[in-house]
Interface confidence: low
């Protein structure tokens, strides 16, 4: 025998208290598939969460984060505090990137400067807390007169010219 509830479309639920009649989902609830025996409660984007998409009878609300925070996790399950460029979020709050690392975004971790010498290249522009180094052409690529760029002396640490 076919399950009578299978005829209930998305946006309704199979109401067992009413002889398995398909009843519309109550306010603030939804069913995204047919044949459901209950409607799911809509997600509420409260506090540091902000509504990106309102809940409908067939789809859940979608949240993002208020300014100063960014989403983490599937479906923006958490909001994490933004930091400034040149910083990363630690358990003690926003901290400046350590020397030799950078972060050009308001989220995420500080990443090491590119080691230009690994590719046989020179450092064209030194790195900062906010920006990676810019690698120049390798000295071998610079035949006399081929470029007006004079590469700086090779750095002892990636991205940092000798003092």
């Amino acid at each position: 025998l076919q399950d009578p509830c299978s005829n209930c479309p998305a946006g309704t639920f199979c109401d067992n208290n009413r002889n398995q009649i398909c009843s519309p989902c109550p306010p603030n609830s939804f069913s995204s598939a047919g044949g459901q025996r209950t409607c799911d409660i809509c997600r509420q984007c409260k506090g540091v969460f902000r509504t990106r998409k309102e809940c409908s009878s067939t789809s859940n609300a979608e949240c993002d984060c208020t300014p100063g925070f960014h989403c983490l996790g599937a479906g923006c399950s958490m909001c994490e505090q933004d930091c400034k460029q040149g910083q990363e979020l630690t358990k003690k709050g926003c901290k400046d990137c350590c020397f030799g690392t950078f972060n050009d975004q308001k989220r995420g971790r500080c990443r090491p400067w590119t080691n230009c010498s690994l590719d046989g290249k020179s450092v064209l522009v030194n790195g900062t807390k906010e920006r990676d180094v810019v690698c120049g052409p390798s000295p071998a690529d610079l035949s006399p007169g081929a470029s007006s760029v004079t590469p700086p002396a090779p750095a002892r640490e990636p991205g940092h010219s000798p003092q």
């Epitope: 409260k46 540091v48 505090q81 358990k91």
Partner: antibody, heavy 117, light 107 residues
Amino acid sequence: QVQLQESGPGLVKPSETLSITCTVSGSSLTSYGVHWVRQPPGKGLEGLGVIWPGGSTNYNSALMSRLTISKDNSKSQVSLKMSSLTAADTAMYYCARVTGTWYFDVWGQGTTVTVSS
Amino acid sequence: DIQMTQSPSSLSASLGDRVTISCSASQGISNYLNWYQQKPDGTVKLLIYYTSTLHSGVPSRFSGSGSGTDFTLTISSLQPEDVATYYCQQYSKLPWTFGGGTKLEIK
């Protein structure tokens, strides 16, 4: 170093309104939320409500009609007001900083409130 | 509201013992659970967040585990300074709610 310090009246009469202030130092109220928690004598912790960096609030549903949480960013102060007090509101009241990743990482020392005539 | 139930409500253990405290949620809360320690003088400190992440400065003898509705706080080797009441707290849904607490004493 981040510190939170609660200050309250100590003794309040039944039916009156309680007003407690949480002063935050070493942290900006525009970057973190503040949650109020209370603990009746000999009992567990009960969350009262939170005020977010942008100023929006969420309250314990059972106490919502009696609670107001507000803040003054320039003074780094958060205030809790609770109306229609009864003896059941006698408790230690704490404020705690809420990080964007949803935990209370710094707590105040608490302020004792006794509701009695 | 989501109800959080802790067990036992109190326990007594010897120094060096392995201690476990349980916390149960009335509905699934994924891993959205924190643990706090309240010392006898009333001071409250965060121990563990997001079920198992140790807060900075918390000794490594503390650990947390679980998912869904059942969670555990473990102290691998009980120390005198661990005498306190321990609370779990869910942040899956507002209002955030605490367990009833587990009072830990030394035998």
